[in-house]
Interface confidence: low
């Protein structure tokens, strides 16, 4: 009886038609750009307030006749997926509708950055509590557009928008590709990524995210009771956008990052089939499908981190990929990898007063990635320390030799073209986990970290023959912020995290063959905060009596037994 | 089109004698740069928006608009603001000939300018 | 005037399903959910759920999510409820009762008779 | 589930007295978007269907005696009659609104 995409969105141990409250969301104002919307909608009256803005262009066509039905549909639907009263998935938002798609559901980016303006001044004229701006449309790659969203996001506002509806990458349109929009992509009730008639979702490393997005059950502009099902990625981002509602209705002081986290944090992982996706775009696309958090209490001692995968660099023989984390996030470690096994691997350095990871081509190299693993780590001081290349045969080392400073990542960068597979010793010296080993031919980058009650370990996997793929997961309770491979030879086609996990990937065996070279050992360095832990408990303590609702209070957990693995 | 003519005229006789007194040249070393969409079928040529630096004022970008202008009609071409950017983005829109883009990637202020492009419902 | 008209008293016996119908006057059919609500001999008032006749949405209470099935007739103006697998447990008077649809409104202004539902062997 | 819990659960009064039920909820029921407690107040009268009385807490139904009064908020309910009349005596039921649907227990109200 209840629709499965919002069965779909809640946590596996609770039933959608508890966990969703008439309140849920009722501290949050979302905007909508898009079509104009049948306000007086049973799902949506009450709830959207349309604006006077209007910027779209003429319809195509000199036999286009203007029905309000038609013109009102796709904004209708999304506004009843985000707050309807039966098909809603944050049933309390507000709505402010902004007409920048036309009857035909077309519309420009120039009249997009004039309604991203409009709501900016809005903000500033009547500031309320946290904004959410749904935007389910998409246009080619726009650095004009980017740039706008770039500067809402800066001032505060959460922006969630459509991957796109044209199985492509999602790099490759607006404002999909801006890094500071949570980007959403479309599955099914199947876990699968949703098609389109020839067509389908976009994927990639610009997309955040996976939220349902086909056969959608939501309000039809037909009638005001009438409901209809749609389909796309801009049903996939409306969920997103009640989804972070809802979380900040909980906890209104929530950051961008800190929600673009707790959104990762909380989605089902690893239920997606891979198989539908371009194969050189599986392993930059992420396998997540959205989920509400179990209780809006408890996260905040969570050690959130997330992998940002840069660009590719191409192919030529100096270039070089960069991977950034979000201003408010720390780099805790930078890892690269390239398909074709020639890279001269990745090193942390500062730019613009931030850390950045950049991967490095090698001669004869298709190219190159880096990848970086973002933390949110309050008061953390991180610094890279380097040794250069050892040139002696015990390889490279270096430690975190700061009182207080942890080590949270490793990273080795060779300026020979090919390490060999002088094979440096793998197991670093008992006594002394604060310390990276490398290549002796390679200069080896430790990310080192002091920030309260920041702990830290690292856990190895070795595998004695040679393997495509190895891989080490942190435990229960334990973020992953370090992944990296021993020993950094030339078989070894780089390392990444995926969620808690790190993976390293070699060349295919049959071209390594089985000598003991091939040897591969996954390098994990997993994290926990005791201070977020006792500053979440303190939180809570002082908030119990503040009368602030607590909107999923009536499926309160402890939070060491969720375990996010969908139905 | 009569209407249209009358305009022109105005804004040539409103505007030349304004143009003389703009005579800053864009900072050296920096060269504003050009976009448009990769896919052809979305482009709307003869609607820009030009970015203007981080830090401009709403004036200097009411001031390059008209500077802009001023140096279209100078050239014969008529041009159209539609919107001036502040609060976000500074900078504005206008509608204009290509033809001018050479001229107005080299007014001062000027970061890039985009040719404006459609977007769809997904 | 608005009135909720429901259908008589039932006997029946363990193992089988019932089914209860609750008539809608004076008023638009599709602007109200219908809930329905079970009060057991001599006990209190329990939800058991509800239908939203536009869109079809029904909600349950946990305890009577295998138990109650609500289903509405536009065209008549009617909602249903059926009960399966019926028990002794299942004894009690059952009632419909009208909300609007409104954000605000979560209250039941108008109910039906009630309908006894008894189940013995 | 929110959980209700009225008392007393069965009181015994006089005409013209003065009576107090009260409604505790286990979590709040105010709704901080539209600031107003989703409670309703309901009597019933042996062999009939419930009568709504209060709405939002505080708000009387139409048609409902200005006898009858709600008050509360957050978590603590009460049902107020301030002079019992002889159609008066029945059972009451608090009802939470906020997250689903939940009624209290009942309180009866019988003559002295």
């Known amino acids: 009886s209840i629709p499965w995409n919002l069965e779909r969105i809640t946590p596996p141990r609770y039933r959608a038609d508890e966990y969703q409250p008439p309140d849920g969301g009722s501290l949050v104002e979302v905007y909508l750009l898009d079509t104009s919307i049948q306000s007086d909608h049973r799902e949506i009256e009450g709830r959207v307030m349309v604006t006077d803005f209007e910027n779209v262009p003429e319809e195509d066509g000199t036999r286009f006749h203007r029905q309000a039905s038609k013109c009102d549909s796709h904004g209708t639907h999304l506004a009843g997926v985000v707050s309807g009263r039966d098909a809603g998935v944050a049933k309390g938002a507000s709505m402010r509708s902004l007409r920048v798609l036309n009857c035909q559901g077309k519309g420009t980016v120039s009249g997009t950055l004039i309604g991203l303006e409009f709501i900016r001044k809005s903000q500033l004229v009547q500031p309320v509590g946290p904004l959410v701006v749904l935007l389910p449309l998409a246009g080619g790659y726009s650095r004009v557009l980017n740039a706008a969203c770039q500067r809402l996001a800066r001032a505060g506002v959460v922006l969630v928008t459509a991957a796109g509806n044209f199985r492509d990458d999602a790099c490759l349109y607006s404002p999909a590709s801006a890094p500071e929009v949570i980007t959403v992509g479309a599955t099914n009730a199947q876990d699968q990524p949703v098609t389109l008639g020839t067509l389908g979702t976009n994927f990639g490393r610009c997309v955040d995210l996976f939220a349902p997005g086909e056969d959608i059950i939501g309000a039809s502009s037909d009638c005001s009771t009438c409901f209809v099902s749609q389909s796309g990625t801009s049903q996939a981002a409306a969920h997103v956008a009640g989804i972070a509602a809802m979380m900040l209705s909980a906890e209104p002081e929530l950051t961008l990052a800190e929600l673009r986290q707790r959104l990762i944090h909380f989605s089902a992982k690893d239920v997606i089939n891979e198989a539908w996706f371009p194969e050189d775009q599986r392993v930059l696309t992420p396998n997540l499908v959205a989920a509400l958090p179990p209780s809006t209490h408890g996260a905040g001692w969570q050690l959130f981190c997330r992998t940002v995968w840069s660009a590719h660099s191409g192919p030529t023989r100096m270039a070089t990929a960069v991977a950034r984390c979000a201003p408010d996030e720390e780099l805790l470690s930078c890892s690269s990898f390239s398909r074709s096994g020639k890279r001269r691997g990745e090193r942390m350095e500062a730019q613009g007063g931030k850390l950045v990871c950049r991967a490095h081509n090698a001669f004869g190299g298709e190219g190159v990635y880096a990848i970086a693993r973002c933390c949110l780590l309050p008061q953390a001081n991180c610094s890279v320390h380097t040794a250069p290349p050892a040139e002696a045969s015990m390889g490279t080392r270096v430690h975190c030799h700061q009182q207080g400073h942890v080590l949270t990542g490793c990273s080795s960068h060779w300026e020979v073209e090919d390490l060999g597979t002088h094979k440096p010793p793998v197991l670093r010296p008992r006594g002394q986990p604060n310390q990276c080993v490398g290549h002796r031919e390679a200069s080896i980058h430790a990310s080192c970290c002091h920030a309260p009650g920041l702990e830290c370990k690292v856990k190895e996997h070795g595998i004695p023959a040679p393997q495509e793929q190895v891989t080490v997961a942190c435990e229960e309770g334990w973020t992953l912020t370090g992944c990296s491979a021993l020993p950094g030879t030339s078989h070894v086609l780089g390392a990444y995290a995926v969620d808690n996990t790190c993976v390293v990937r070699s060349r295919d065996v049959s071209t390594t063959g089985s000598t003991s070279e091939g040897a591969v050992t996954a390098v994990a360095i997993c994290c926990r905060s005791r201070h977020l832990a006792q500053a979440s408990q303190e939180l809570q303590g002082s908030t119990s009596g503040s009368g602030l609702n607590d909107i999923f209070e009536a499926q309160k957990i402890e939070w060491h037994e969720h375990h996010h693995h969908h139905h | 089109q009569e209407d249209e003519d009358g305009d022109y005229e105005e804004l040539v006789l409103a505007l030349r004698s304004e143009e003389d007194g703009l005579a800053e040249a864009p900072e050296h070393g920096t060269t504003a740069t050009f976009h448009r969409c990769a896919k052809d079928p979305w482009r709307l040529p003869g609607t820009y928006v030009v970015v203007l630096k981080e830090e401009t004022h709403l004036s200097q970008s009411e001031r390059t608009a008209r500077r802009l202008q001023a140096q279209a009609a100078r050239r014969g071409y008529l041009t159209k603001i539609l919107h001036v950017f502040h609060g976000l983005l500074p900078g504005f829109l206008v509608k204009m000939s290509g033809d001018l883009l050479e001229l107005a990637l080299k007014l001062p202020h000027v970061d890039y300018i985009e040719e404006d492009s459609s977007v769809f419902a997904q | 005037q608005v009135q909720l008209v429901q259908s008589g008293a039932e006997v029946k016996k363990p193992g089988a399903s019932v089914k209860v119908s609750c008539k809608a006057s004076?008023?638009?059919?599709?602007?109200?959910?219908m809930h329905w609500v079970k009060q057991a001999p001599g006990q209190g008032l329990e939800w058991i759920g509800y239908?939203?006749?536009?869109?079809?949405?029904?909600k349950y209470h946990q305890n009577f999510k295998d138990k109650a099935t609500l289903t509405a007739d536009k065209s008549i103006s009617t909602a249903y409820m059926e009960l399966s697998r019926l028990t002794s447990d299942d004894t009690a008077v059952y009632y419909c009762?009208?909300?609007?649809?409104?954000?605000?409104?979560?209250?039941?202004?108008?109910w039906g008779q009630g309908t006894t539902v008894t189940v013995s062997s | 589930d929110i959980q209700m819990s009225q008392s007393p659960s069965s009181l015994s009064a006089s005409v013209g007295d003065r009576v107090t039920i009260t409604c505790k909820s286990s979590?709040?029921?105010?709704?901080?978007?539209?600031?107003?407690?989703?409670l309703a107040w309901y009597q019933q009268k042996p062999g009939k269907a419930p009568k709504l009385l209060i709405y939002?807490?505080?708000t009387r139904e139409s048609g409902v005696p200005d006898r009858f009064s709600g008050s509360g908020s957050g978590t603590d309910f009460t049902l107020t009659i301030s002079s019992l009349q002889p159609e008066d005596f029945a059972t009451y039921y608090c009802?939470?609104?906020?997250?689903?649907?939940?009624f209290g227990q009942g309180t009866k109200l019988e003559i002295k």
């Open positions: 004076g008023y638009t059919f599709n602007d109200y959910w």
């Open positions: 009802k939470q609104s906020f997250n689903l649907f939940t």
């Open positions: 939002w807490a505080s």
């Open positions: 979590q709040s029921l105010l709704n901080s978007r539209t600031r107003k407690n989703f």
């Open positions: 009762a009208r909300q609007y649809d409104y954000d605000e409104d979560w209250y039941f202004d108008v």
């Open positions: 239908i939203n006749p536009s869109s079809g949405f029904t």
